[in-house]
């Protein structure tokens, strides 16, 4: 029951994760207008990683797209290309991961196949949220890097014409959902590489065999003291005899192609 | 076709105080930043003050600073400026205004009501 | 606070002759994010109510005659009437728009000679 808990758990945690990564990637407030220096503006900037608005106080708003490839600096690609890799690793994650929940039944998949594909959906969520935080990371640290440069140079020449106070840019709002999505799926990853342990056969249990001693009469149980006991790693006490109704917790694994343990 | 009709303007004392009103029609006024502009008589226009769309903004001109007071009423499609503390050099022209244009430009502009500080 | 300078005060010219409007702002008013100029001129006939013109520095409002041009950028912005008409007389106002408080130009008076 713990592990379909935690499974299920994971499973949403980095839903809403990939859903706040897709969310990030396309919001346009990766960086807004600093008004420190001019709270009172009657115009306000922001920037996506596709691109840039003005609003004005009319209420009128104008985005422009970065209709260009090579214009564009070599960060702001890097940091689409993870925020994207991001996204696709995830959506990827989820789709396995729908398959490996213990929770739905497909066919006759055994539980050893589930727990591979949770591991697999759990490292790809875990990735997906390391790259939407190496992103937006990246992003904030470019933010950072010409907010400095700017405060330095506060009023630039235009043309050697025209005295203009240069606009500085802060973190916007798209950072702060990035790094809560990113930890979330991170987290959720986790969980479900937490729930594949729990799902795969720790231990390989046979059908009790006889064997019959010349003058006695004894049925040993392979596992010995543990099996007949209780203790060491099979501590649900699985049934070692075939037959009788089972609960879904109680069914027993076989060796099969698929055992990594 | 935009309306923008001011009233409440009138005779007051120094000291005195008085609300102007500015309805509006013709447009969605509630999605749109509205202004109060001032001309005293044989002078240029001074801006006066400026609230936003859902009045999360409101800006004065600094000679009207503490004393007066912008709200609008979305429902009512209506504009108020609450004059307090009223002096001589406030007796103009007023009138209201919409950003209904691109650039912050005032598109639109009310008659006017006028507003006269005497004792 | 941005502080407008405009000038003449007034100008009188002969009807189809070029008027010239100076408007110099004490700060910039270009916004680098759309890469235009935050400065609007508007038309005030005797006892008529201010009307707009100019938006942007340069964009006309639609149905305003394309002999009035606005041009300039960052501090220093101009309104030219190219043919003065009998109907453009008037005063003529610059704005900031950029930041508040919404400062006004004292105004250019435009008369015929």
């Known amino acids: 029951m713990a592990v379909t808990a935690c499974q299920g758990l994971g499973f949403v945690v980095s839903l809403i994760g990939i859903a706040g990564i897709i969310a990030a990637t396309c919001m346009d407030q990766w960086s807004t207008q600093d008004l420190y220096n001019n709270p009172v503006t009657a115009v306000f900037n922001y920037q996506g990683l596709w691109r840039s608005c003005v609003r004005e106080s009319s209420g009128f708003t104008e985005c422009r797209g970065y209709f260009t490839l090579l214009g564009l600096p070599a960060m702001l690609q890097a940091v689409r290309a993870l925020m994207i890799v991001g996204i696709v690793l995830g959506a990827i994650g989820l789709l396995v991961s729908i398959f490996a929940l213990k929770c739905i039944r497909i066919g006759s998949m055994e539980d050893s196949a589930k727990a591979n594909m949770t591991l697999t959906s759990g490292i790809m969520f875990i990735v997906s949220g390391l790259c939407a935080i190496a992103g937006v990371s990246v992003f904030a640290n470019m933010l950072v890097t010409n907010f400095w440069m700017s405060t330095a140079n506060m009023y630039t020449g235009m043309g050697g014409m025209v005295q203009t106070v240069q606009t500085r840019y802060t973190f916007g709002a798209a950072l702060f959902v990035g790094w809560v999505a990113g930890g979330l799926t991170l987290i959720g990853g986790v969980m479900m590489c937490i729930a594949c342990r729990g799902l795969a056969p720790e231990e390989t249990n046979y059908k009790a065999v006889s064997y019959h001693a010349s003058g006695h009469s004894v049925a040993y149980k392979p596992g010995g003291f543990k099996a007949s006991t209780g203790f060491g790693s099979n501590t649900k006490n699985k049934k070692i005899y075939d037959g009788g109704a089972r609960t879904e917790d109680e069914v027993q694994s076989y060796p099969s192609k698929h055992d990594y343990v | 076709d935009v309306q923008l009709v001011e009233s409440g303007g009138g005779l007051v004392q120094p000291g005195g105080s008085l609300r102007l009103s500015c309805a509006a029609s013709?447009?969605?006024?509630?999605?749109?930043?509205m202004h109060w502009v001032r001309q005293a008589p044989g002078k240029g226009l001074e801006w006066v003050a400026y609230?936003?769309?859902?009045?999360?903004?409101?800006y004065y001109a600094d000679t009207v600073k503490g004393r007066f007071t912008l709200s609008r009423d979305n429902p009512k499609n209506t504009l108020y400026l609450q004059m307090n503390s009223l002096r001589a050099e406030d007796t103009a022209v007023y009138y209201c205004?919409?950003?209904?244009?691109?650039?912050?430009?005032?598109?639109?502009w009310g008659q006017g009501t006028t507003v006269t500080v005497s004792s | 606070d941005v502080v407008l300078t405009q000038s003449p005060d007034s100008l009188a010219v002969s009807l189809g002759e070029r008027a010239t409007i100076s408007c110099k702002s004490s700060?910039?008013?270009?916004?680098?994010?759309?890469?235009?100029?935050?400065l609007t001129w508007y038309q005030q006939k005797p006892g008529q109510t201010p009307t707009l013109l100019i938006y942007?520095?340069?964009t006309r409002k639609s149905g305003v005659p394309d002999r009035f041009t606005g041009s300039g950028s960052g501090t220093d912005f101009t309104l030219t009437i190219s043919s003065l008409q009998a109907e453009d007389v008037a005063v003529y106002y610059c704005?900031?728009?950029?930041?508040?408080?919404?400062?006004f130009g004292a105004g250019t008076k435009v008369e015929i000679k």
């Open positions: 205004a919409t950003s209904y244009y691109y650039g912050n430009a005032l598109e639109y």
């Open positions: 609230i936003s769309s859902g009045s999360g903004s409101i």
């Open positions: 013709g447009f969605t006024f509630s999605s749109f930043g």
């Open positions: 704005q900031n728009v950029y930041s508040y408080p919404l400062t």
């Open positions: 700060q910039s008013l270009f916004n680098v994010g759309n890469q235009k100029n935050y």
């Open positions: 942007w520095a340069s």
